[in-house]
């Protein structure tokens, strides 16, 4: 015959069971708290280190560009893409219109000092964007030249010259002595013309966006 459990033993069992449940619950909650804290700290540290990295990158660039204009982009809006102020941005590049009248070589050197090159135009969309900010009675040097006068046009950044993606005005280029290209407004449209490199013109600089 099985001896009957005494009431105090039953109570002790219930109490023990409850203690075990509460212990598991408390330990779980503690573990969750610890996990949450750790992940918060880790996340905070990650964000903090990202911010620190960003700030140090910004400081580094500020040696060259006193002011940067940045926008958030990327799938999580976590990346910043920046252009020097007051440059304009289009796709992955920044553009600066120089109204200083200089020779082609001096214009390119001027862009170079700013970490850029005279503009290389790759698409009609890019040209349309650039021309929105140009004056129709002015001409602007492009990063396109033919130094030997052999009609071997070359872009300053070594991008291959593709005849199919050029926007010469009708009848241009037309002189082997005119070895540098400008963009100007003629016959109701913007297009390219070959001119003498030593004749001072305005110019357009282009650089890659700065990602931080």
């Amino acid at each position: 015959m099985v001896p009957e459990e005494e009431p105090q033993d039953r109570e002790k069992g219930v109490w023990w069971f409850q203690l075990k449940v509460w212990s598991v619950a408390v330990v779980s909650i503690l573990l969750l708290c610890v996990c949450f804290t750790v992940s918060s700290v880790a996340s905070h540290n990650f964000m903090y280190s990202k911010t620190v990295k960003r700030l140090s990158k910004l400081q580094e660039y500020q040696q060259y560009y006193p002011s940067l204009t940045c926008v958030m982009e990327g799938k999580d809006m976590e990346d910043w893409s920046c252009c020097p102020t007051p440059w304009t941005s289009f796709q992955s590049s920044c553009y600066f219109i120089s109204t200083v009248m200089q020779s082609w070589t001096k214009s390119q050197n001027n862009c170079s000092v700013m970490g850029a090159d005279l503009v290389v135009i790759n698409t009609k969309e890019e040209q349309d964007f650039i021309t929105q900010n140009l004056k129709i009675n002015s001409a602007y040097f492009l990063g396109l030249s033919d130094p030997k006068g052999w009609r071997h046009w070359q872009w300053v950044d070594q991008t291959p010259y593709n005849k199919n993606v050029t926007f010469w005005h009708s009848g241009e280029p037309n002189s082997p002595d005119e070895r540098c290209a400008i963009i100007n407004f003629r016959s109701e449209e913007w297009g390219w013309n070959d001119v003498h490199c030593h004749v001072p013109q305005k110019s357009i600089c282009k650089m890659k966006k700065i990602y931080i």
Epitope: Q102, S103, W104, T105, K106, Q108, N109, S145, P147, K148, G149, S175, P176, D177, R179, C180, V195, H196, C197, H198, V199, P200
Partner: antibody, heavy 121, light 111 residues
Framework: EVQLVESGGGLVKPGGSLRLSCAAS????????MSWVRQAPGKRLEWVST????????YYPDSVKGRFTISRDNAKNSLYLQMNSLKAEDTAVYYC??????????????WGQGTTVTVSS | DIVMTQSPDSLAVSLGERATINCRAS??????????MHWYQQKPGQPPKLLIY???NLESGVPDRFSGSGSGTDFTLTISSLQAEDVAVYYC?????????FGGGTKVEIK
């Protein structure tokens, strides 16, 4: 043989005008940019004006801008320099020179013998 | 404007000896591999004559005792063995931008 022959120099009073001419021969004149370069007595050479082969471009230093005008007549193989409001400091030998393009610029490969302009009262 | 400074102003060299003329530009007259500096010789009562273009290219018909070198702002014209017919004033000229400008000239004489 390339030849450049200047004419039209002479003595003129301050405020007066002169027209210099340069007759070119021995080369295809219309294919070359041309310049006028002057040399005051005992001074360095000073470029005065340039005209492109197609006549599309003319350029002057500030010292003569608005007073001098360069032009050409490709049919006559001739280059001209119209000089108005002449000053004593314009006194010089005026050379006509042919331009040859080299890379991004040009140099002067042939020069005429020069014509003397004297501005004096 | 780019200012061209030549040195010395005058130079006396023995026949057969080397003559060296320097020209300094107030800013670079080179772009990549293009050096837009040229040298001219002017004898008394004559127009200038081109000797060297693009810093180091000898104009056709010019004796090879003449040579040029340099880049950026500093350029040199050398006459390796001075001849009597080399007595003249020598000028440097930059053409990287308008206006083209000339040096003040160096007078070369025989010692």
């Amino acid at each position: 043989e390339v030849q450049l022959v200047e004419s039209g120099g002479g003595l003129v009073k301050p405020g007066g005008s002169l027209r210099l001419s340069c007759a070119a021969s021995g080369f295809t004149f219309r294919s070359y940019g041309m310049s006028w370069v002057r040399q005051a007595p005992g001074k360095r050479l000073e470029w005065v004006s340039t005209i492109s082969s197609g006549d599309s471009y003319t350029y002057y230093p500030d010292s003569v801008k608005g007073r001098f005008t360069i032009s050409r007549d490709n049919a006559k193989n001739s280059l001209y320099l119209q000089m108005n409001s002449l000053k004593a400091e314009d006194t010089a030998v005026y050379y006509c020179a042919r331009q040859i393009y080299y890379d991004y610029a040009y140099y002067f490969d042939f020069w005429g013998q020069g014509t003397t302009v004297t501005v004096s009262s | 404007d780019i200012v061209m400074t030549q040195s010395p102003d005058s130079l006396a060299v023995s026949l057969g000896e080397r003559a060296t003329i320097n020209c300094r530009a107030s800013e670079s007259v080179s772009f990549r591999t293009s050096h837009l500096m040229h040298w001219y010789q002017q004898k008394p009562g004559q127009p200038p004559k081109l000797l060297i273009y693009g810093a180091s290219n000898l104009e056709s018909g010019v004796p090879d005792r003449f040579s040029g070198s340099g880049s950026g702002t500093d350029f040199t014209l050398t006459i390796s063995s001075l001849q009597a017919e080399d007595v003249a004033v020598y000028y440097c000229q930059q053409s990287i931008e308008d206006p083209p400008t000339f040096g003040g000239g160096t007078k070369v004489e025989i010692k």
